[in-house]
């Protein structure tokens, strides 16, 4: 059964998200469950480190993008939000909080601002930003 949730403040058009736990979950209360992942969008602006700590306090991590297919709802996300991607200056690579390296062709990395953290933006774009800049953020929790 598909339950329509219209998250106009989060997405740039009406997005239908399945909410039945038999299909997806369990997730923390009021989180979005989609294709075996739980997501929550936080409106308060925090720097990257504070955002990471907030997610960790809820037994989650900042958003990790690992599949355009499984995470297709991210195509339509409004605005910019911290995700768990950081730049490693020593080798120039981008890696996730769990230490895994960003897979090629998953994100378009956009270099306009200088920094070592990245904001997620619609259509799988990652905008580099100074880690100390306050922004909204997305937490993610994998379901078992």
């Amino acid at each position: 059964i598909w339950s329509a949730v219209f998250l106009n403040s989060l997405f740039n058009q009406e997005v239908q998200i399945p909410l039945t736990e038999s299909y997806c979950g369990p997730c923390p209360k009021n989180w979005i469950c989609y294709k075996n992942n739980c997501y929550q969008f936080f409106d308060e602006s925090k720097n990257w480190y504070e955002s990471q700590a907030s997610c960790m306090s809820q037994n989650a991590s900042l958003l990790k993008v690992y599949s355009k297919e499984d995470q297709d709802l991210l195509k339509l996300v409004k605005s910019y939000h911290w995700m768990g991607l950081v730049h490693i200056p020593t080798n120039g690579s981008w890696q996730w909080e769990d230490g895994s390296i960003l897979s090629p062709n998953l994100l378009t990395i956009i270099e306009m601002q200088k920094g070592d953290c990245a904001l997620y933006a619609s259509s799988f774009k990652g905008y580099i930003e100074n880690c100390s800049t306050p922004n909204t953020y997305i937490c993610m929790q994998r379901t078992v």
Partner: antibody, heavy 127, light 108 residues
Framework: QVQLVQSGAEVKKPGASVKVSCKAS????????ISWVRQAPGQGLEWMGG????????NYAQKFQGRVTITADESTSTAYMELSSLRSEDTAVYYC????????????????????WGRGTLVTVSS | SSELTQDPAVSVALGQTVRITCQGD??????ASWYQQKPGQAPVLVTY???KRPSGIPDRFSGSSSGNTASLTITGTQAEDEADYYC???????????FGGGTKLTVL
């Protein structure tokens, strides 16, 4: 093919207004910002302002605030720049330029990488 | 300050390497892009971000950034590289775009 086609040269008297058009083709017009940049004879480039067609609201350089109006017509994929109260110092070539990156819905951030330019429109202000 | 400063003129011998610089406070926080403009023509984007090039731009053009300075380097300069070069970036104080004054490159 991706291009920006600008309207032809104009000669105006001081105090008058001029409206220059820029017709886009070959890409999704509404998704990318258009900026207007001018260049006086023998001088450098000067950003006047820009607009994201789907967003609607324009952003202007302080120098031109109140004198320039930038608009976009989605139905014809055309951007316009109108400059009023013309003076001789406004004699210049006026370029439209497309943003490299598309607009992120819900939050305006300026783009300063311009990957496509019109050929320019010469506006001469003379009495 | 909300200004980008470039040397007005630079010359280079054919086949040699030349570096054109752009300085400004905003470059501490933002990357620049570089444009080539030949007489009577519109500007062309040659590099942007952390040394990215649009398709069709030869790899002899490269960009770099350090502190408040952005640089455009042309390695093995060709006669056709003679042009004016402009940097641009974002104003530190708001949602505005700023250009440097331009550098006239002469190939000897």
């Amino acid at each position: 093919q991706v291009q920006l086609v600008q309207s032809g040269a104009e000669v105006k008297k001081p105090g008058a207004s001029v409206k220059v058009s820029c017709k886009a083709s070959g890409y999704t017009f509404t998704s990318y910002g258009i900026s207007w940049v001018r260049q006086a004879p023998g001088q450098g480039l000067e950003w006047m302002g820009g607009i994201i067609p789907i967003f609607g609201t324009a952003n202007y350089a302080q120098k031109f605030q109140g004198r320039v109006t930038i608009t976009a017509d989605e139905s014809t994929s055309t951007a316009y720049m109108e400059l009023s109260s013309l003076r001789s110092e406004d004699t210049a070539v006026y370029y439209c330029a497309k943003d490299l990156y598309d607009y992120v819905w819900g939050s305006y951030r300026p783009n300063w990488y311009f990957d496509l330019w019109g050929r320019g429109t010469l506006v001469t202000v003379s009495s | 300050s909300s200004e980008l400063t470039q040397d007005p003129a630079v010359s280079v011998a054919l086949g040699q390497t030349v570096r054109i610089t752009c300085q400004g406070d905003s470059l501490r926080g933002y990357y620049a892009s570089w444009y080539q403009q030949k007489p009577g023509q519109a500007p062309v984007l040659v590099t942007y971000g952390n040394n990215k090039r649009p398709s069709g731009i030869p790899d002899r053009f490269s960009g770099s950034s350090s502190g408040n300075t952005a640089s455009l380097t042309i390695t093995g300069t060709q006669a056709e590289d003679e042009a004016d070069y402009y940097c641009n970036s974002r104003d530190n104080n708001g949602n505005f775009v700023i250009f440097g004054g331009g550098t006239k490159l002469t190939v000897l």
